[in-house]
């Protein structure tokens, strides 16, 4: 606000006032009178730029007069009092109320003093973020969606991600006239590495004290990625039993594991136990390629592993005791 003038009366008011759609707002406006200065205010007037006539007048002898009596009210001005506070309350804010207003004091003998105030009509948006569940498409698709509904002015949406990708943001009219719904999609090429990772949608708006952060956990549906572990290339005869594990990453979860060999069904010394294959001790060398086939809703994938059980002196540190 401007500092009070020395030796002159000054109208004090903020340059901009925010108000919320449908709510009430006060446009503050005061006359600052230096200590020694005598002044007499006979009239307070509010008008809107670009419109003829006044929207609100308070006259020292006649009291208030409003263009819209149900929507306007002088907050402090009263008959029989010094008119120093022209603050005006507006009820039921509408989009079309946004604009520049002039608050004017008619003071004697100093003359008229006025100030302009910009009324911003805001609407606080509602924000949501949701995952867009996708499959491996090989091309960029939306994996997350962030929506800021019914904001005025439109909210500003940005994304934070370590996964790469790019935003695609669009606007559409909100439910209430003058409001805007902003929709932003986070787009990337889906991969299994993306599944379960998160991206953050950041929504900024004048009505927020601080930005709103909405985290989305991504979902990428993909067929099983399979590998077999548990073999260290160092198995020998007459040692303990060992275990091979079929490691599968998939979304949705695997529905079944099937063990076999390149020669067909499993040999007697290999026993399937779901994701694991138990290899019992053998008495002669073997050279067998095991196959683990994993199925989920999107399909089946398999991995192969060739296991050799070699002759050689058993030791504490070698053999089939890999588990």
């Amino acid at each position: 606000w401007p500092p009070p003038g020395t030796g002159d009366i000054v109208v004090q008011a903020p340059t901009q006032v925010p108000g919320f759609l449908g709510d009430s707002v006060t446009l503050p406006c005061y006359l600052q009178v230096p200590g020694m200065e005598e002044t007499h205010v006979s009239q307070l007037t509010w008008s809107r730029h670009g419109e003829s006539g006044s929207m609100a007048v308070f006259h020292q002898t006649q009291g208030p007069n409003y263009s819209e009596p149900k929507r306007l009210e002088f907050v402090a001005a009263r008959l029989g009092t010094e008119l120093r506070d022209a603050s005006l309350r507006m009820f039921g804010l509408r989009v079309e109320d946004e604009g520049n207003y002039t608050c004017l004091f008619v003071a004697f003998p100093q003359g008229s003093r006025s100030v302009d105030i910009w009324l911003r009509v805001l609407a606080k948006p509602q924000n949501t973020a949701e995952v867009q569940k996708v499959q491996l498409t090989g091309k960029p698709v939306p994996v997350a969606r962030c929506v800021s509904t019914g904001g005025r002015p439109p909210a500003h949406i940005t994304w934070h991600s370590d996964l790469g990708g790019m935003p695609n943001t669009s606007q559409a009219p909100g439910f209430l006239s003058g409001t805007v719904t902003v929709t932003s999609l986070w787009i990337l090429v889906p991969s299994s590495q993306v599944d379960g990772k998160s991206v953050t949608c950041k929504v900024e708006h004048e009505s927020f004290e601080k930005p709103q952060l909405l985290t989305v956990n991504l979902t990428v549906y993909y067929p099983p990625e399979v590998s077999i572990s548990g073999y260290d290339n160092n198995w020998y005869l007459s040692q303990n039993e060992a275990t091979l594990t079929c490691d599968a990453r998939s979304n949705p979860e695997p529905t079944g594991y099937n063990w076999s060999t390149t020669m067909g069904p499993l040999p007697p010394f290999a026993v399937a136990q779901g994701a694991q294959l138990l290899i019992r001790p053998v008495d002669k060398p073997i050279n067998t390629t095991f196959i683990c086939n994993v199925t989920n809703a999107l399909g089946a994938r398999q991995a192969e592993l060739t296991v050799q059980v070699k002759e050689g002196p058993p030791s504490e540190h070698s053999g089939m005791s890999s588990n």
């Epitope: 005598e38 007499h40 020292q60 003998p109 008229s112």
Partner: antibody
Framework: QVQLVQSGAEVKKPGASVKVSCKAS????????ISWVRQAPGQGLEWIAW????????NYNQKFTGRVTMTTDTSTSTAYMELRSLRSDDTAVYYC??????????????WGQGTTVTVSS | QAVVTQEPSLTVSPGGTVTLTCRSS?????????ANWVQQKPGQAFRGLIG???NRAPGVPARFSGSLLGDKAALTLSGAQPEDEAEYYC?????????FGGGTKLTVL
């Protein structure tokens, strides 16, 4: 047209009081500011006070505070100035003046014809 | 109380330009003094010309203009007419009271 018609000349003794009237016509009296000004023989003009006719709010020159009272009668659109404890140096022509407003500033717009007050023993 | 000083008399030729000034004993005249100018012709009532330093009263010819000139208030008459011959008074506002100048007798000759 706008007119201010003042009461006739007065002769008063020292220590007495005088009440001068100023009847307005041709404008909305209650929305006006009226100043009272005097001019002693061979002297310059001297501002006494102003009154806002609609409410009776006043502002007095400190020199006259306690001796002068300004009032209005809105029913007759008349302003009054009463000066008490008259002295010989109060002998002067007393004027009422309506302040006009240009939309930006005030000015001494219309003046009455003046009322001569003579204080003599 | 402040003293407001004007030129006692000035003369201007018909059609000529003349500037009447108004000095304050308290220092420079500013817009916060809301300088007023009134005219009084012989045998006639006072008439307001200027208010608030430079605002011409309705009906006042454009040849009259008010301003601040250096540290003084000024009334400039451009293209003087014989009927402009009169006494001109300056009035200044000092926070809570008006003070009148002594007046300038303007002769159009």
């Amino acid at each position: 047209q706008v007119q201010l018609v003042q009461s006739g000349a007065e002769v008063k003794k020292p220590g007495a009081s005088v009440k001068v009237s100023c009847k307005a016509s041709g404008y909305t009296f209650t929305s006006s500011y009226i100043s009272w000004v005097r001019q002693a023989p061979g002297q310059g003009l001297e501002w006494i006070a102003w009154i806002y006719a609609g409410t009776g709010d006043t502002n007095y020159n400190q020199k006259f505070t306690g001796r002068v009272t300004m009032t209005t009668d809105t029913s007759t659109s008349t302003a009054y100035m009463e000066l008490r404890s008259l002295r010989s140096d109060d002998t002067a022509v007393y004027y009422c003046a309506r302040h006009g407003y240009t939309g930006r500033g005030w000015y001494f717009a219309v003046w009455g014809q003046g009322t001569t007050v003579t204080v003599s023993s | 109380q402040a003293v407001v000083t004007q030129e006692p008399s000035l003369t201007v030729s018909p059609g000529g330009t003349v500037t009447l000034t108004c000095r304050s004993s308290t220092g420079a005249v500013t817009t916060s003094n809301y300088a007023n100018w009134v005219q009084q012709k012989p045998g006639q009532a006072f008439r307001g010309l200027i208010g608030g330093t430079n605002n011409r009263a309705p009906g006042v010819p454009a040849r009259f203009s008010g301003s601040l000139l250096g540290d003084k208030a000024a009334l400039t008459l451009s293209g003087a007419q014989p009927e402009d011959e009169a006494e001109y008074y300056c009035i200044l506002w000092y926070s809570n009271h008006f003070v009148f100048g002594g007046g300038t007798k303007l002769t159009v000759l």
